[in-house]
């Protein structure tokens, strides 16, 4: 999906009002310096591309974040403020339902959410280019 035509200011508002708080809640009890950020993003479409992938792709040691509150709110924000996003996600959602697993917060998931916080902060930077 090409995130170029999203309403970035509306997504930023959603991040500031709720998503950021849910990320903090997920990371509660973890020091902010515990994980090194190894990925970043260039402009807002890039940030959303990486946020979407990191939030919804299973990775080694962290099977799924998709059912976490911040992930569901991220998905809702993208669906509302990115034209055509919902249509591109129908097949992906169906596949995810088939492989849904018990929620387990592993250290790897905490590290992944720490990376997500960094990507969202970068997205939120006032000087970041739209595209």
């Amino acid at each position: 999906y090409d995130f170029t035509n999203c309403d970035f200011e509306k997504i930023k508002a959603a991040y500031l009002s709720t998503i950021s708080k849910d990320l903090i809640t997920y990371m509660s009890g973890t020091k902010s310096t515990e994980f090194n950020n190894t990925v970043s993003c260039s402009n807002r479409p890039h940030c959303l591309t990486e946020i979407q992938s990191l939030t919804f792709n299973p990775t080694a040691g962290c099977a799924s974040l998709a059912k976490e509150m911040f992930a569901m709110k991220t998905k809702a924000a993208l669906a509302i403020w990115c034209p055509g996003y919902s249509e591109t996600q129908i097949n992906a959602t169906q596949a995810m339902k088939k492989r849904r697993k018990r929620k387990v917060t592993t250290n790897k998931c905490l590290e992944q959410v720490s990376q997500l916080q960094g990507l969202w902060r970068r997205f939120n930077r006032p000087l970041l280019k739209q595209q």
């Epitope: 990925v39 260039s42 890039h46 591309t49 990486e50 992938s53 990376q115 280019k129």
Partner: antibody
Framework: QVQLQESGPGLVKPSETLSLTCAVS?????????WSWIRQPPGKGLEWIGY???????SYNPSLKSRVTISRDTSKNQFSLKLSSVTAADTAVYYC??????????WGQGTLVTVSS | EIVMTQSPATLSLSPGERATLSCRAS??????LAWYQQKPGQAPRLLIY???SRATGIPARFSGSGSGTDFTLTISSLEPEDFAVYYC??????????FGQGTKVEIK
């Protein structure tokens, strides 16, 4: 300390597919960062080809996107480049590199690929 | 596409002298700029990122400055091992990251 090493054929015929592999040691490619390919034609500047991230996203240079595939083999801790329909203009030293998806902090030594019949 | 232009193409200096290399972007890249050093037969090495932050292990004689469209890499006092080609790279314009054509710093 992370080390990267490119390998693959040094000579490819025009219209064929160039295939290179980058073996990574000292860091797991599924643990963090992005993993990228960059090339440098003889005597010229650098050109970014593309990357994949440790969580599976990929991004390619628009000028090469239709011909490029970057894939990974986490069991061998290596990643690969395929560039199809090559011409003489694809003759270059090809580097693999570790990236934070913005800039490139560790590089392989590079491998020269010549496109010629 | 953002075009990166480096000047001069070649800089002839003696060890101990100060080197000032320029990189200009065709449109603003904010501070999204990196500098690399490349010696003959070797891979590039990251020197500076975010326009002015030194990469790990890079000596203090290397410094970067600038933002927007005009950037400078300064080597305060050239050491023999500093004679090489230097490239700038913008990462403001994903997915079209681009490099300059390089400045060669040679021994006078």
């Amino acid at each position: 300390q992370v080390q990267l090493q490119e390998s693959g054929p040094g000579l490819v015929k025009p219209s064929e597919t160039l295939s290179l592999t980058c073996a990574v040691s000292g860091y797991s490619i599924s643990s963090g960062y992005g993993w990228s390919w960059i090339r440098q034609p003889p005597g010229k500047g650098l050109e970014w080809i593309g990357y994949f991230s440790y969580y599976g996203s990929t991004s390619y240079n628009p000028s090469l996107k239709s011909r490029v595939t970057i894939s990974r083999d986490t069991s061998k801790n290596q990643f690969s480049l395929k560039l199809s329909s090559v011409t003489a203009a694809d003759t270059a030293v090809y580097y693999c590199a570790r990236t934070n998806l913005l800039y490139f902090d560790s590089w392989g030594q590079g491998t020269l690929v010549t496109v010629s019949s | 596409e953002i075009v990166m232009t480096q000047s001069p193409a070649t800089l002839s200096l003696s060890p101990g002298e100060r080197a000032t290399l320029s990189c200009r972007a065709s449109q603003s890249v904010s501070s999204n700029l990196a500098w690399y050093q490349q010696k003959p037969g070797q891979a590039p090495r990251l020197l500076i990122y975010d326009a002015s932050s030194r990469a790990t292990g890079i000596p203090a004689r290397f410094s970067g400055s600038g933002s927007g469209t005009d950037f400078t890499l300064t080597i305060s006092s050239l050491e023999p091992e500093d004679f090489a080609v230097y490239y700038c790279q913008q990462y403001s314009n994903w997915p079209q990251y681009s490099f300059g054509q390089g400045t060669k710093v040679e021994i006078k």
